[in-house]
């Protein structure tokens, strides 16, 4: 059974992940056309189901494409280097989902824009945090 300290650690990690994802989303929402138009043509795979920490496997598998689009659309106003940002997210995701269990991610039938993708994972983090508090 999870201890209160491990639950607290999980909660802090999820909050950190949530902040990172929100920071990316805020950065994108500040982009003006035509950059935003271009970014929205970059498609992401969405999880069929995302209710448990193991489902973060689906996020992990899309981190490389996320870094790719952030690099391509790198703005002089975006102060964090995409590589560092995604690397931080990757470390948190690996710790949260655990490396002991191998989970095969199942994706939804339709791909989504970067905004829909980020919102989906932001909602996931908020949902899990709410169950922990």
């Amino acid at each position: 059974a999870p201890t209160s300290s491990s639950t607290k650690k999980t909660q802090l990690q999820l909050e950190h992940l949530l902040l990172d994802l929100q920071m990316i989303l805020n950065g994108i929402n500040n982009y003006k056309n035509p950059k935003l138009t271009r970014m929205l043509t970059f498609k992401f795979y969405m999880p069929k189901k995302a209710t448990e920490l193991k489902h973060l496997q689906c996020l992990e598998e899309e981190l490389k494409p996320l870094e790719e689009v952030l690099n391509l659309a790198q703005s002089k106003n975006f102060h964090l280097r995409p590589r560092d940002l995604i690397s931080n997210i990757n470390v948190i995701v690996l710790e949260l989902k655990g490396s002991e269990t191998t989970f095969m991610c199942e994706y939804a039938d339709e791909t989504a824009t970067i905004v829909e993708f980020l919102n989906r994972w932001i909602t996931f983090c908020q949902s899990i945090i709410s169950t922990l508090t």
């Epitope: 271009r38 970014m39 043509t41 970059f42 391509l72 659309a73 002089k76 791909t111």
Partner: antibody
């Protein structure tokens, strides 16, 4: 090997309908946009439009909007270009192309072999 | 639509000699915020499908020899071949993808003298 294989040459009469295909293999079909390019006899290249098989998001060049329909069936990794009523001026070679996870950020790195469409009475 | 204009229409070349093709766009292809210039070059060899040579102004596509290079800024672009080889003959096209719809130049036919 990453490739796009197109359907064979077609000879049609004006007013007839037609659907040509482009099958992708050697890569994850739903990760990349598939575009269509026209080349009329002895002429240059014209970009017609594009589809994302992952969600069927489709964009047309204004010059081709309403003239053709672009579609895809991701279950068989195939994109289509179709006409409901062909005209003699549709006579051309049609190429399908692969264009990255975003058609703005990537060039057309893979091309089909082309489908020759001849429309003549 | 962005209009792409290529010159010359035809370019006779001598193997081993350098060659260059020009392309001009009706508006800037540079996104100054990103620092990306959304211009590609394609080669269509006789009887073949076109192939990507250069993307985003100056990046060589996979398998493209280093004798090909792309340069330019804003609205004026050049494809250079440092030493032309017989296999380089065909029609070269520039294409912009900064704005919808994507548009090609009219093409430059490179042939051996």
């Amino acid at each position: 090997e990453v490739q796009l294989v197109q359907s064979g040459a077609e000879v049609k009469k004006p007013g007839e309908s037609l659907k040509i295909s482009c099958k992708g293999s050697g890569y994850r079909f739903t990760s990349y946009w598939i575009g269509w390019v026209r080349q009329m006899p002895g002429k240059g290249l014209e970009w017609m439009g594009i589809i994302h098989p992952g969600d069927s998001d489709t964009r047309y060049s204004p010059s081709f909007q309403g003239q053709v329909t672009i579609s895809a069936d991701k279950s068989i990794s195939t994109a289509y270009l179709q006409w409901s009523s062909l005209k003699a001026s549709d006579t051309a070679i049609y190429y399908c192309t692969r264009q990255g996870r975003s058609f703005y950020y990537y060039g057309m790195d893979v091309w089909g072999q082309g489908t020759t469409v001849t429309v003549s009475s | 639509d962005i209009v792409m204009t290529q010159t010359p229409l035809s370019l006779p070349v001598t193997p081993g000699e350098p060659a260059s093709i020009s392309c001009r766009s009706s508006q800037s292809l540079l996104d100054s915020d990103e620092g990306n210039t959304y211009l590609d070059w394609y080669l269509q060899k006789p009887g073949q499908s076109p192939q990507l040579l250069i993307y985003t102004l100056s990046y060589r596509a996979s398998g493209v020899p280093d004798r090909f290079s792309g340069t330019g800024s804003d609205t004026d672009f050049t494809l250079k071949i440092s030493r032309v080889e017989a296999e380089d003959v065909g029609v070269y096209y520039c294409m912009q993808r900064i704005e919808f719809p994507l548009t090609f130049g009219g093409g430059t036919k490179v042939e051996i003298k």
